[in-house]
Amino acid sequence: SGTTNTVAAYNLTWKSTNFKTILEWEPKPVNQVYTVQISTKSGDWKSKCFYTTDTECDLTDEIVKDVKQTYLARVFSYPAGNVESTGSAGEPLYENSPEFTPYLETNLGQPTIQSFEQVGTKVNVTVEDERTLVRRNNTFLSLRDVFGKDLIYTLYYWKSSSSGKKTAKTNTNEFLIDVDKGENYCFSVQAVIPSRTVNRKSTDSPVECMGQEKGEFREI
């Protein structure tokens, strides 16, 4: 069935959430395989995902070494089967990815409300400090550990009986808000990095309402 040419990868796209980072590309290979290389601007090109027929490569282990660095990846197309290499002088075809700076670009994952506790007319709402795959001294860092005060949370809260939302902000993982006595409230939070120009906000957390399991109610 005749020879075909190797095809360069295209649509190289970084998919990254809370630093879990995967490079995706097209096309699905026919009689070819791919090897990915990743580098910082000043570093060596390191091969990963050798001779794969996948069209994605998990590069998390590389980018978490320094999330503030800017990375570039490239995808090589290698003939595998009844094909001819179209690279010059036996050099394989490759395509470069866009640059990627994890600290500035990784998507913020959907946060989770860990708990809420009412004491009189005050409610303390705690956001789960999600673990990332970034390591320091052999332990995984949380989102707060990585972003510090660059990361804030916005709390949306409203009376169960009405639709009017109020907001609060914190640069920790806790909110302390005033509520009306005898009213049940619902809560949702969103992670935000105000200094960013892209991917500034996460999706909203699942809604949690008072009178359900997560909360604790104490009338003082």
Epitope: P29, V33, W45, K46, Y51, T53, A80, S85
Partner: antibody
Framework: EVQLVQSGAEVKKPGESLKISCKGS????????MNWVKQMPGKGLEWMGM????????RLNQKFKDKATLSVDKSISTAYLQWSSLKASDTAMYYC??????????WGQGTTVTVSS | EIVLTQSPATLSLSPGERATLSCSAS?????MNWYQQKPGQSPRIWIY???NLASGVPARFSGSGSGTDFTLTISSLEPEDFAVYYC?????????FGGGTKVEIK
């Protein structure tokens, strides 16, 4: 010119330790994974694993996980294969080979290791 | 791990004859290399990516196959072709070699 030069033949007793070397020259040593391949006398080839010199990440064949250790010294462009306690079954020719695509193919000349009491 | 089985273990042929070497994988492989090794020498890449001839390899050699069955063919043996040939898969870790086929002079 790319060259991989391996250390000389070794004769050891069971239980002894050993470190053999593979020095790369003529290319950016830290940019290429380095493979190690074992060949027992009169037998076939076995892929032991490979190491990336820039950060020492290793991919090891589980068969050799508790038997051999891969390391590098970037400052002298040298990869190492070592054993803490040799066995008779470690008697073999050991090759280092730069991980390359396609026609690029660079192997060391091999190091003969003989383990005998 | 993927086990590669080469057959026959030894192939006794005369110069000018056709040689067919087989490599069978225990599960599907997408990237297969073949190496040639002569006595006292390091292995040399011979065919890469299933069917691509390495630099300097004569056109009488060819490689083919897909999935679990791969073949190295020498259309007409020359004296310098007598050697051991190994297949190697690089589709999944650990990378593995076949046991080799020795092509010897009959």
């Amino acid at each position: 010119e790319v060259q991989l030069v391996q250390s000389g033949a070794e004769v050891k007793k069971p239980g002894e330790s050993l470190k053999i070397s593979c020095k790369g020259s003529g290319y950016s040593f830290t940019s290429y994974w380095m493979n190690w391949v074992k060949q027992m006398p009169g037998k076939g080839l076995e892929w032991m694993g490979m190491i990336y010199p820039a950060d020492s990440e290793t991919r090891l064949n589980q068969k050799f996980k508790d038997k051999a250790t891969l390391s590098v010294d970037k400052s002298i462009s040298t990869a190492y294969l070592q054993w803490s306690s040799l066995k008779a079954s470690d008697t073999a020719m050991y090759y280092c080979a730069r991980e390359d695509y396609g026609s690029s193919d660079y192997w060391g000349q091999g190091t003969t290791v003989t383990v005998s009491s | 791990e993927i086990v590669l089985t080469q057959s026959p273990a030894t192939l006794s042929l005369s110069p000018g004859e056709r040689a067919t070497l087989s490599c069978s994988a225990s599960s599907s492989v997408s990237y297969m290399n073949w190496y040639q090794q002569k006595p006292g020498q390091s292995p040399r890449i011979w065919i890469y990516g299933i069917s691509n001839l390495a630099s300097g390899v004569p056109a009488r050699f060819s490689g083919s196959g897909s999935g679990t069955d791969f073949t190295l063919t020498i259309s007409s043996l020359e004296p310098e072709d007598f050697a051991v040939y190994y297949c190697q898969q690089k589709s999944s870790f650990p990378w593995t070699f076949g046991g080799g086929t020795k092509v010897e002079i009959k």
